[in-house]
Interface confidence: low
C-alpha cells in the first residue's frame, strides 16, 4: 500500500508525498483538524496524511471550538484530498 | 471471542501437496491480514506468509524457505485463510498455526492464535 | 534477511528472581519487536509488542525495551506459571523469529 503523508500543514499541496506503507499498514488516513468559533473566527487548518493499520475513528469529531474530521481510505494513494 | 481453528494437516509424501484451512470467528476477517507461522518438533517459530485484505488486491508475502512451493488465499464470505503447500519437503513438517493481530485495540502484532495442524512429510 | 538472535537459550532460575532475556537484530528495526510466550503443546501468547507495550491481560511483572538493534525482555519476580519458552520477533522487514529462550524453576 502506498498513502500520501504529511503533518500539520496548512495546505494539501505540502501533502503530496507518497509514502510507501509498512506490511502492518491497510489504512491511508487523512486528519484535518480546524479551531474557531462557528463559522465566524478561524484560529488556524491544519492536515496530516498517514498509512495507518487501522481506521482510527470512523466519523468526524466535533469538540467544542475545535472539530477534526478523519477519513480512511484502503487503495493505492487514495489519500489525495 | 475470537477463534482460530485450522483443519487438513496430515501424513504426505515428499513432492506431494496438502491444504491446510483456518475459519476464522469473533472479528471482522475482511479487514484483516491473516498469517502462517510454523512450529517442526522441538524447534522455534517460523513465519510462513500472509495475506492482506482485498482493497489491497489481497496482497501476498512468503519467507523465502516456502516461496514458489506455497500459497496463501481467503475467501472472506466464508471466513477462512487457505494455505496451498506444494513440493512439500520433509523439513516442512512441523505444526502450523494461522494467526491474526488485533486492530482494534492499536495491537498489530500476532494477537490471536489457532489451536495448530500438524503435517508430516514422510515416506 | 533480518536476523534475531536471542540469548540465552535456555535458563534456571528461582521462584521471586528476576529474569532478564536479551534479543539483538541483525539491522535496525525500530521498535518494531514482539515478545511471545509459548508452553508446551500450546500456541505462543503475545505477551508484549511494539518493544515496551503489555499486551491486554498480561500481568505486570512481564515488560520490554529497547530500539533499534538491542532489546531485553523481562519478568520482574519469576512465577510457577511462567515455565515457557519465550520468544522475541522483529516485524520490521516480513517476521523473524528469535530461536527461543527456554525458562525453567530451579
Known amino acids: 500500500l502506498m498513502c500520501f503523508s504529511c503533518l500539520n500543514q496548512k495546505s494539501n499541496l505540502y501533502c503530496l508525498k507518497p509514502t510507501i506503507c509498512s506490511d502492518q499498514d491497510n489504512y491511508c488516513v487523512t486528519v484535518s483538524a480546524s479551531a474557531g468559533i462557528g463559522n465566524l473566527v478561524t484560529f488556524g487548518h491544519s492536515l496530516s496524511k498517514t498509512c495507518s493499520p487501522a481506521c482510527p475513528i470512523p466519523e468526524g469529531v466535533n469538540v467544542g471550538v475545535a472539530s477534526m474530521g478523519i477519513s480512511c481510505c484502503q487503495s493505492f494513494l487514495c489519500n489525495f484530498s | 471471542e475470537v477463534q482460530l481453528v485450522e483443519s487438513g494437516g496430515g501424513l504426505v509424501q515428499p513432492g506431494g501437496s496438502l491444504k491446510l484451512s483456518c475459519a476464522a470467528s469473533?472479528?471482522?476477517?475482511?479487514?484483516?491480514?491473516m498469517h502462517w507461522v510454523r512450529q517442526a518438533s522441538g524447534k522455534g517459530l517460523e513465519w510462513v506468509g500472509r495475506i492482506r485484505t482485498k482493497p489491497v488486491n489481497y496482497e501476498t508475502y512468503y519467507a523465502d524457505s516456502v516461496k514458489g512451493r506455497f500459497t496463501i488465499s481467503r475467501d472472506d464470505s466464508k471466513s477462512t485463510v487457505y494455505l496451498q503447500m506444494n513440493s512439500l519437503k520433509t523439513e516442512d513438517t512441523a505444526v502450523y498455526y494461522c494467526s491474526a493481530p488485533n486492530y482494534y485495540d492499536g495491537t498489530y502484532s500476532f494477537a490471536y492464535w489457532g489451536q495448530g495442524t500438524l503435517v508430516t512429510v514422510s515416506s | 534477511d533480518i536476523q534475531m538472535t536471542q540469548s540465552p537459550s535456555s535458563l534456571s532460575a528461582s521462584v521471586g528472581d528476576r529474569v532478564t532475556i536479551t534479543c539483538k537484530a541483525s539491522q535496525n528495526v525500530g521498535s518494531n519487536v514482539d515478545w511471545y510466550q509459548q508452553k508446551p503443546g500450546k500456541a505462543p501468547k503475545l505477551l508484549i509488542y511494539?518493544?515496551?507495550n503489555r499486551y491486554t491481560g498480561v500481568p505486570s511483572r512481564f515488560s520490554g525495551s529497547g530500539s533499534g538493534t538491542d532489546f531485553t525482555f523481562t519478568i520482574s519476580s519469576l512465577q510457577p506459571e511462567d515455565i515457557a519458552t519465550y520468544y522475541c520477533?522483529?516485524?520490521?522487514?516480513?517476521?523473524?523469529f528469535g530461536q527461543g529462550t527456554k525458562v525453567e524453576i530451579k
Open positions: 520477533m522483529q516485524s520490521e522487514t516480513k517476521y523473524t
Open positions: 469473533g472479528f471482522t476477517f475482511s479487514t484483516v491480514a
Open positions: 511494539k518493544a515496551s
